[in-house]
């Protein structure tokens, strides 16, 4: 899915209002320095691509994130504010239903959610250049210059 046409500000508002709190709840009792952040993103569409991947794709040692509250709210936000996103997720939803229902918080899952927090932080506050500056690095973000 191409996240270029999402309403980034509405997704940011959803994150700040609810999703962030659910991530904190999931990570409760974990030190912020416990994990090395290895996943990064360069602009807002890229950040959403990485967020989707980490949130919904099962990985070795962490198969259960898609059933967490923050994941369901993330899915809802993307479905509402990204045109056509829901249609692309039908197969993924069916696969998710087949996944085992027990929620096990492994250390690998905690590490993955720590990475997610960093990605969301980056999504919410990309460093946008001043208008008139010639050294823009995030071309995808140019049209979002005034609201980030």
């Amino acid at each position: 899915y191409d996240f270029t046409n999402c309403d980034f500000e509405k997704i940011k508002a959803a994150y700040l209002s609810t999703i962030s709190k659910d991530l904190i709840t999931y990570m409760s009792g974990t030190k912020s320095t416990e994990f090395n952040n290895t996943v990064s993103c360069s602009n807002r569409p890229h950040c959403l691509t990485e967020i989707q991947s980490l949130t919904f794709n099962p990985t070795a040692g962490c198969a259960s994130l898609a059933k967490e509250m923050f994941a369901m709210k993330t899915k809802a936000a993307l479905a509402i504010w990204c045109p056509g996103y829901s249609e692309t997720q039908i197969n993924a939803t069916q696969a998710m239903k087949k996944a085992r229902k027990s929620k096990v918080t492994t250390n690998k899952c905690l590490e993955q959610v720590s990475q997610l927090q960093g990605l969301w932080r980056r999504f919410n506050r990309p460093l946008l250049k001043q208008q008139g500056s010639s050294d823009y690095k995030d071309d995808d973000d140019k049209h979002h210059h005034h609201h980030h």
Partner: antibody, heavy 120, light 111 residues
Amino acid sequence: QAYLQQSGAELVRPGASVKMSCKASGFAFTTYNMHWVKHTPGQGLEWIGAIYPGNGETSYNQKFKDRATLTVDKSSRTAYMQLSSLTSEDSAVYFCAREDDYGEGYFDVWGAGTTVTVSS
Amino acid sequence: DIVLTQSPASLAVSLGQRATISCRASESVDNSGLSFMHWYQQKPGQPPRLLLYRASNLGSGIPARFSGSGSGTDFTLTLNPVETDDVATYYCQQINTDPLTFGAGTKLELK
């Protein structure tokens, strides 16, 4: 506990440059925007710019863009600010600050400040 | 650039009374229903300390004597009741539009 340790006071000549440091500990340095803020009794607080340590991307206040250079050394978890072509107007306390956990755009961790005095 | 105008520039309040500081933005700092206006307290020789984020949310460890309100272009910081430890300069800050800007500050003194 998140902490920012800034370098010591500097006395510099007009026209010279100064480079100050801000060493981070207690948090995932590469995933937080790091900012620099100038404080003078007359002017209050002024935002100079910010850097994202993850990839070195920067954003500057146009007022400081030509004279301020922000860099990071990820291995030592240190942010740097160099100010060039100094004048007496640059005499101030310079703070580094970490942007918040969520990307709300507020500063929740501050360094103690580096005092820069420009005098001949 | 968004200009933040704080008023008054200074005020003197008696212990136990209410102090109200205003911050007016030259354009709205709201976005998708959220107000990206923050407040700080700064004492001489110290870095600023976050008081309130997004207009009305208390920062970590900040007592409930501090409160904030407002949206769009008009925001208010209220201290009630004022204590001796509140003598400081207070700044508003917006982040909705680059560049990030601060108000000129309001100096709070005791009567």
